[in-house]
């Protein structure tokens, strides 16, 4: 028996359902009573879901997995993972045994988009050209860790005096805080871009400092 899985990682958004595709080619006369199907975590070999002796043995993994029972006889051994969490990320092995056996691994990459950044300024009044200001760009609830880029109004990257911290919450999602320290010119726009490297999603925030009231 030959097992086939997608070579590309499966990308799943947090709290959505994901399908880990796995298939085999059943011989003529194949019956489910002959099938021994095991989904397991590749690294630890922890059982995730199994089908043996003609019966779905159920989820051994947070009760959030399911097979496609009506499609098994056609060789579809895919696994449905419900309400994906950050901790589900990793490699899963589909192990199929009929008379002989084969297995293949598929990777699950979990992702969550970052929120539109909020911008804060310190100090935020009585600003004069030549003053040192601290601009903070904050974006929330994303995964995996973000890439943060700062630019001035002309699109020139600002790399000096940038400090970025990323903290994971109890769900494993990251809150990003990036701080730019800059000496004010006469007028200036400072923009922050928070990029999710898996989703290729960019979230933008900017602040414009003029002689007039600040605009965000």
């Amino acid at each position: 028996v030959e097992v086939q899985v997608s070579e590309d990682p499966v990308v799943a958004l947090v709290d959505t359902d994901a399908t880990l595709r796995c298939s085999f080619s059943p011989e003529p006369g194949f019956s489910l009573a002959q099938l021994n199907l095991i989904w397991q975590l590749t690294d630890t070999k922890q059982l995730v879901h199994s089908f043996t002796e003609g019966r779905d043995q159920g989820s051994a993994y947070s009760n959030r997995t399911a097979l496609f029972p009506d499609l098994l006889v056609q060789g579809n051994a895919s696994l449905r993972l419900q309400r994906v969490r950050v901790t589900d990320e990793g490699s899963y092995t589909c192990f199929v045994s009929i008379q002989d056996f084969d297995s293949a691994a598929v990777s699950l990459q979990v992702a969550a988009p970052y929120s539109k950044p909020s911008m804060t300024l310190e100090p935020n009044k009585d600003l004069r050209p030549g003053n040192m200001v601290t601009i903070t760009c904050s974006s929330y609830q994303g995964y995996p860790e973000a890439e943060v880029f700062w630019k001035d109004g002309q699109g020139v990257p600002l790399t000096g005096n940038v400090t970025t911290s990323q903290m994971a919450n109890e769900r494993g999602l990251f809150d990003v805080h990036s701080v730019l320290r800059v000496v004010l010119g006469a007028n200036g726009t400072y923009s922050c871009l928070v990029r999710n490297p898996v989703l290729q999603q960019d979230a933008h925030g900017s602040v414009t400092i003029t002689g007039q009231p600040l605009t965000f």
Epitope: N36, I38, Q40, T44, K45, Q46, L47, S50, T52, E53, Q57, G58, S59, A60, N63, T93, F95, S97, F101, S103
Partner: antibody, heavy 116, light 106 residues
Framework: QVQLQQPGAELVKPGASVKLSCKAS????????MHWVKQRPGQGLEWIGM????????NYNEKFKSKATLTVDKSSSTAYMQLSSLTSEDSAVYYC?????????WGQGTTLTVSS | QIVLTQSPAIMSASPGEKVTMTCSAS?????MHWYQQKPGTSPKRWIY???KLASGVPARFSGSGSGTSYSLTISSMEAEDAATYYC?????????FGAGTKLELK
Amino acid sequence: QVQLQQPGAELVKPGASVKLSCKASGYTFTSYWMHWVKQRPGQGLEWIGMIHPNSGSTNYNEKFKSKATLTVDKSSSTAYMQLSSLTSEDSAVYYCARESRQLDYWGQGTTLTVSS
Amino acid sequence: QIVLTQSPAIMSASPGEKVTMTCSASSSISYMHWYQQKPGTSPKRWIYDTSKLASGVPARFSGSGSGTSYSLTISSMEAEDAATYYCHQRSSYPLTFGAGTKLELK
């Protein structure tokens, strides 16, 4: 005929580890899940976990996850369970059992005594 | 986890008497399995998939039930039936056993 052979007894000191064995014969070892079950003197049965010899897949009762480690040696058709950081609470009879629909064949059990 | 509650914990029956013991599950399950154990021996498969008798089990035994309520019945007690009977579920992990019903000969 199907047989699961286990040593009759093991005596170990508190804090030590022990590796219990279960040698299978009379069937294709790699085709069936092997389970381990604990029974304290005069008590009921407690499921520890299971291992599939072919894939190496394991599934543990959360209660025993830090206590038991299940492995197999396919070449000798033997299943093993290592128990660590032993205390008197671990003194019990430990059975291996083959799964087919239910736990259809059981070993005779190994009596583990943890005592100094 | 699914908790299996067996009752009674201990019972006695005279030869020829009908015996029924029950097993209640804390959540609905697909099948119940039963094992017989005599002192100093390992458990033996007895009834599987709720009502199917394992090989070598006398026809006087039967099993029934669905959902959360299951039972094992002996139509006519015999001396060799004295043992402890455990119910067992494998519909949900971790697999669990009942605490057992000890059946004694009166």
